[in-house]
């Protein structure tokens, strides 16, 4: 079956938006007014993954770009990156595990846990203008909660 996708933007729980920082990195910062147009629009695809009541497997691509968030080991540490893919083959229902995140949603707050590295989450720093990264702690200084805003296709 073809994969189902929705366009959306994400903001962290401090209302920081996500923008491109160079070709293969995202950063989080507060945006207002016209600057909101800078925020990245994701194509969230609902993909196959392990069955769980509270975790929905998704892939997060950048809308109209052949880039997907993926989780890989770099220097033995789980790391978030933007990975370029062949647009003829993506998105697909059976995404490779490095592209899959378990969306955990409670009261409209979302967390994105790496399927490849359980208990590692898409995270932002408290500080402004810092890279979006994969963090191994929840409830600490770093932010792992996001809100989602729908965007028209």
């Amino acid at each position: 079956a073809p994969v189902r996708s929705l366009n959306c933007t994400l903001r962290d729980s401090q209302q920081k938006s996500l923008v491109m920082s160079g070709p293969y990195e995202l950063k989080a910062l507060h945006l207002q007014g016209q600057d909101m147009e800078q925020q990245v629009v994701f194509s969230m695809s609902f993909v196959q993954g392990e069955e769980s009541n509270d975790k929905i497997p998704v892939a997060l691509g950048l809308k109209e770009k052949n880039l997907y968030l993926s989780c890989v080991l770099k220097d033995d540490k789980p790391t978030l990156q933007l990975e370029s893919v062949d647009p003829k083959n993506y998105p697909k229902k059976k995404m490779e595990k490095r592209f899959v995140f378990n969306k955990i949603e409670i009261n409209n707050k979302l967390e994105f846990e790496s399927a490849q590295f359980p208990n590692w989450y898409i995270s932002t720093s408290q500080a402004e203008n810092m890279p979006v990264f994969l963090g191994g702690t929840k409830g600490g200084q770093d932010i792992t909660d996001f809100t989602m805003q729908f965007v028209s296709s």
Epitope: A1, L6, K103, F150, S152
Partner: antibody
């Protein structure tokens, strides 16, 4: 609690159009797809299409393209389905239902149905 | 379109009996399968989604399972209020498609 309140029964002439409504209460309207389903005696249940009020995305069953037009008004938290060029084949009960935006929970809630009768 | 072949189309069963209704999908539906119950003149009521997850408030005598593309709804001990028509639905691929229904009556 969640409720989907549909508009009342309609008696229509062949060739006319009808617009039926589905008023949602008790949940975040923008985050659930509204589904439209047709039920005719002897024909079972047929899926017509869906709309996600949060972004206006619409998916139709090809069979109903040109027959059904689905819309939603977020300010009144109401979804609509217009049926055009009515014929006796369109005489049916039409239901609205909901499914969460990530498709996980199935058709969770249902309206009470709207009976459309097409007769000369 | 994905065809959902539901069987039996009708059946009689005794109170307390174990009842199983099946739906066969014509292709993979990635466990996006629901079961509904409908009583005469009423709207359908969702019992189960994603093959085996029970909707809140649905009695535990209802259960769902899958084997390949064969999906089953089981009522472990039939109660009088369980009579009605049961439908399956695949919501993996557009257009979503329903089974033809199983009319369950008390013997």
């Amino acid at each position: 609690q969640v409720q989907l309140q549909q508009s009342g029964a309609e008696l229509m002439k062949p060739g006319a159009s009808v617009k039926i409504s589905c008023k949602a209460t008790g949940y975040t309207f923008s985050r659930y797809w509204i589904e439209w389903i047709k039920q005719r005696p002897g024909h079972g249940l047929e899926w017509i299409g869906e709309i996600l009020p949060g972004n206006g995305n619409i998916n139709y069953n090809e069979k109903f393209k040109g027959k059904a037009t689905i819309s939603a008004d977020s300010s009144s938290e109401t979804a609509y389905m217009q049926l055009s060029s009515l014929s006796s084949e369109d005489s049916a009960v039409y239901y609205c239902s909901t499914i969460y935006y990530d498709y996980d929970q199935g058709f969770t809630y249902w309206g009470q149905g709207t009976l459309v009768t097409v007769s000369a | 379109d994905i065809k959902m072949t539901q069987s039996p189309s009708s059946m009689y069963a005794s109170l307390g009996e174990r009842v199983t209704i099946t739906c066969k999908a014509s292709q993979d539906i990635d466990r996006y399968l629901s079961w509904f119950q409908q009583k005469p003149g009423k709207s359908p009521k969702t019992l189960i989604y994603r093959v085996k997850r029970l909707v809140d408030g649905v009695p535990s005598r209802f259960s769902g399972s899958a084997s390949g593309q064969d999906y089953s709804l089981t009522i472990s001990s039939l109660q009088y209020e369980d009579m009605g028509i049961y439908y399956c639905l695949q919501y993996d691929e557009f257009p979503y498609t329903f089974g033809g229904g199983t009319k369950l009556e008390i013997k």
